[in-house]
Interface confidence: medium
Amino acid sequence: MESRKDITNQEELWKMKPRRNLEEDDYLHKDTGETSMLKRPVLLHLHQTAHADEFDCPSELQHTQELFPQWHLPIKIAAIIASLTFLYTLLREVIHPLATSHQQYFYKIPILVINKVLPMVSITLLALVYLPGVIAAIVQLHNGTKYKKFPHWLDKWMLTRKQFGLLSFFFAVLHAIYSLSYPMRRSYRYKLLNWAYQQVQQNKEDAWIEHDVWRMEIYVSLGIVGLAILALLAVTSIPSVSDSLTWREFHYIQSKLGIVSLLLGTIHALIFAWNKWIDIKQFVWYTPPTFMIAVFLPIVVLIFKSILFLPCLRKKILKIRHGWEDVTKINKTEICSQL
């Protein structure tokens, strides 16, 4: 790669902070531990130093250079999740009422249906940022060493975590904007008038439902805090910002706050659900509501994270990452061949 000419001193490479954003738990400190750090993320940074002649790029190079290579996988995954969730929500919210009682709910598609897709995609992508770390830790525990290569797919996944995280933030922001638009909709205004009329009809002076009020206050509040933390993570992933942080600061923000945002997002979804878990009406055509599917992966990730945080396992993982090897699990010949 042409960028290599910009740094001649190999020592400089060691001083650079590799950016593996939105979660950094030293999972790449394995086999190629440090060397893999040189090979991959550093080159991303070196790219930035190599654009002096970017406007004079030869035409043949323009065709061979891939467009946003690291975004391919996250965008594909996001598109698949979004499409499936859209079809699933469409089936439950629009097609079911049409098929069973001739209700035409097509007006729900532009905002209400889309706003069920957005949080689903956002929380799933955020879970996918932290899932490879969990898998990597399990793999390392299983192998008993860090000197064994991860499978290619896991390697690829680990290197696209930043993109997964930024896409998650993007969908979360869209979700917030769509949610804020609810009271502006004509359909909502007409419904509000209907509700007011029904209140008069029923001689109800007070429509207050305490638990429903608490439910919304809590889940909106958690959603705001979760989004704010995601915003902080997104900002710290900007190269100019991340360069101003020490490795420890950067690592702390990306790993600790990241999991906090996933936790808040999950609680936000669970409180939104409230007592709908036991409401049989939610199971349209025997299908669970979207929120039930949405929280599944985040809960799995959080459970595994909690398990891996147990002192006995945590100590072992840290030992492995510092070079310790579990001799009972290592094939001696394998190490010899590697050496």
């Epitope: 709910y105 209907n194 029904q198 029923q202 109800k204 002076e205």
Partner: antibody, heavy 124, light 113 residues
């Protein structure tokens, strides 16, 4: 399993007040459901009298409004109907029935569970 | 008040045949905001309270045989018994719950021919 049972005198003299009680067992009258009174004169159609909501709010049929009072006793899980100044035209089988509470999406629900009914005759 | 008009007043149908009862309301029972028709159908056998068969004009109450079906929208509704059984002999009422006061149709007596 929810049980709804109407009770009260089977015979009421004209101009007096008819009092009926509906006892609900297996379900709290203050949650999830509103409670209605309906009557059916012999061989005639059903007539809705009124209802009491989970919050205690009441709605009455305008044709009977001046004579009707529906109240409840949450400690006994009962609600009652009082119909004043009765005439022979008030002779009917009186039913109490439940309907799911109003909600912001579907507004109202049909009456899904009815008591067996009690015949009240207005005669001197 | 919303006036509910049922037709016919009585209906004699052979066992296994189709029975159709009509119900007309004096104003629409369709809420456009949620696309629901606020109409219910009840079955009342002699000496018994009414039993809910259909609500939202189309939806069968749990436990109700699928030979009972509801149709219609706005002001015109129909209850259909696709294959009349001996136990279906009863008086059938339609009821609106769109507006207070709740009102019932005059009833249709279904008998076996």
């Amino acid at each position: 399993q929810v049980q709804v049972q109407e009770s009260g005198p089977g015979l009421v003299k004209p101009s007096q007040t008819l009092s009926l009680t509906c006892t609900v067992s297996g379900y709290s009258i203050t949650s999830d459901y509103s409670w209605n009174w309906i009557r059916q004169p012999p061989g005639k159609k059903l007539e809705w009298i009124g209802y009491i909501g989970e919050s205690g709010s009441t709605v009455y049929n305008p044709s009977l409004k001046s004579r009707v009072t529906i109240s409840r006793d949450t400690s006994k899980n009962q609600f009652s109907l009082k119909l004043s100044s009765v005439t022979a035209a008030d002779t009917a089988v009186y039913y109490c029935a439940r309907e799911r509470n109003y909600d912001y999406e579907l507004y109202y629900y049909a009456m899904d569970y009815w008591g067996q009914g009690t015949l009240v005759t207005v005669s001197s | 008040d919303i006036v509910m008009t049922q037709s016919p007043d009585s209906l004699a149908v052979s066992l296994g045949e189709r029975a159709t009862i009509n119900c007309k309301s004096s104003q629409t029972l369709l809420y456009r905001s949620n696309q629901k028709n606020y109409l219910a159908w009840y079955q009342q056998k002699p000496g018994q309270p009414p039993k809910l068969l259909i609500y939202w004009a189309y939806t069968r109450e749990s436990g109700v045989p699928d030979r009972f079906s509801g149709s219609g929208s706005g002001t015109d509704f129909t209850l259909t018994i696709s294959s009349l059984q001996a136990e279906d002999v009863a008086v059938y009422y339609c009821q609106q719950y769109y507006k207070y006061p709740r009102t019932f149709g005059g009833g249709t007596k279904v008998e076996i021919k």
